[in-house]
Interface confidence: low
């Protein structure tokens, strides 16, 4: 069964800077990845970045750098300054659109006890969406 995993890490050097890593565990080819915060994309969440494996990347503040790590995983660095900066209990979600399986999404956040520089373990929590 396809899965999506999400890691959230607070950078030790910049306590208000976050790195989100997401990956897709499945056999299908990825057609689109959407990263959002505050909840799933389309369900109250706000889009931070859209990554298409062939056609490029869009990102919006406070996203600073979205990139592909592998053909099935991405990372996103968030700026940590200003009113729109993330906080420790912010939920981040990654949605992978994959043909022919459909869209799979998982969310994660920093565990309450996280030390700076440590990451939450991968949290696969796929939701099948027929969109």
């Amino acid at each position: 069964t396809p899965e999506v995993w999400v890691q959230v890490r607070m950078e030790a050097t910049e306590l208000s800077s976050f790195t989100i890593r997401c990956g897709f565990l499945g056999s299908g080819s990825i057609s689109l990845v959407t990263v959002s915060w505050g909840g799933p994309n389309g369900a109250g969440g706000t889009t931070l970045a859209v990554l298409h494996p062939e056609r490029g990347i869009r990102q919006w503040a406070p996203a600073r750098q979205a990139r592909w790590e592998t053909q099935s995983s991405i990372s996103l660095i968030l700026e940590g300054s200003g009113a729109s900066s993330p906080c420790a209990n912010t939920t981040f979600c990654c949605k992978f659109a994959s043909f022919p399986e459909g869209s799979w999404e998982a969310c994660g956040s920093l565990p309450p006890s996280s030390d700076p520089g440590l990451s939450a373990p991968p949290t696969p929590a796929p939701i099948l969406r027929a969109d």
């Epitope: 062939e54 490029g56 990347i57 990102q59 919006w60 592909w68």
Partner: antibody, heavy 122, light 106 residues
Framework: EVQLVQSGAEVKKPGASVKVSCKAS????????IYWVRQAPGQGLEWMGT????????SYNQKFRGRVTMTRDTSTSTVYMELSSLRSEDTAVYYC???????????????WGQGTLVTVSS | QNVLTQSPATLSLSPGERATLSCSAG?????LHWFQQKPGQAPRLLIY???NLASGVPARFSGSGSGTDYTLTISSLEPEDFAVYYC?????????FGQGTKLEIK
């Protein structure tokens, strides 16, 4: 027939601003993003940024952050690129190109404007 | 930013010959696009997503590669192929182009 028609050549003084227009026709304007590329004389291509014509979102090359603004007018199917605080090194031909919207199939960047020469000189 | 380095800077060949243009990325990219530009004209998309021919592009053009190394090949040069060729990556922001390879008649 798909067409992107850009405004005419401009001569500007250092410190001034320039606003280049790109009028689209022959397709549904809001179905495609528009992106801007510039080319200094005898030089290569440089991506400046992209605007989503359907919801006005923009993504800029950080090199131009704070100086470039891309807007669109859906009533006239026109996209504008404004570059402020001009300097001599901004002298270039500025192109708009029709990009894809993320859910639409290929081709990628398949139509371009004819280019607008902006000369910055005191 | 991801710097794309094209080689050679200039390639001098005769019609009918095979042309091989290279593009090397500073860091790995998923896909690469190739554009052709003739003097006084806007660029024209040739190859998208590494190996796919854009609409109307002759079959003598082909693209290949992965990771950091990509190639554009023209199997048998026609007079209209002499131009400047640019590679472009869209795997990370800002999108970047190579500096170009000028293909000239020998």
């Amino acid at each position: 027939e798909v067409q992107l028609v850009q405004s005419g050549a401009e001569v500007k003084k250092p410190g001034a601003s320039v606003k280049v227009s790109c009028k689209a026709s022959g397709y549904t304007f809001t179905d495609y993003w528009i992106y801007w590329v510039r080319q200094a004389p005898g030089q290569g291509l440089e991506w400046m940024g992209t605007i989503d014509t359907s919801d006005h979102k923009t993504s800029y090359n950080q090199k131009f952050r704070g100086r470039v603004t891309m807007t669109r007018d859906t009533s006239t199917s026109t996209v504008y690129m404004e570059l402020s605080s001009l300097r001599s090194e901004d002298t270039a031909v500025y192109y708009c190109a029709r990009d894809f919207i993320i859910t639409v199939n290929y081709p990628v960047v398949d139509y371009w404007g004819q280019g607008t020469l902006v000369t910055v000189s005191s | 930013q991801n710097v794309l380095t094209q080689s050679p800077a200039t390639l001098s060949l005769s019609p009918g010959e095979r042309a091989t243009l290279s593009c090397s990325a500073g860091s790995s990219v998923n896909y690469l696009h190739w554009f052709q530009q003739k003097p006084g004209q806007a660029p024209r998309l040739l190859i998208y997503s590494t190996s796919n021919l854009a609409s109307g592009v002759p079959a003598r053009f082909s693209g290949s590669g992965s990771g950091t190394d990509y190639t554009l090949t023209i199997s048998s040069l026609e007079p209209e192929d002499f131009a400047v060729y640019y590679c472009q990556q869209r795997s990370s922001l800002p999108f970047t182009f190579g500096q170009g390879t000028k293909l000239e008649i020998k």
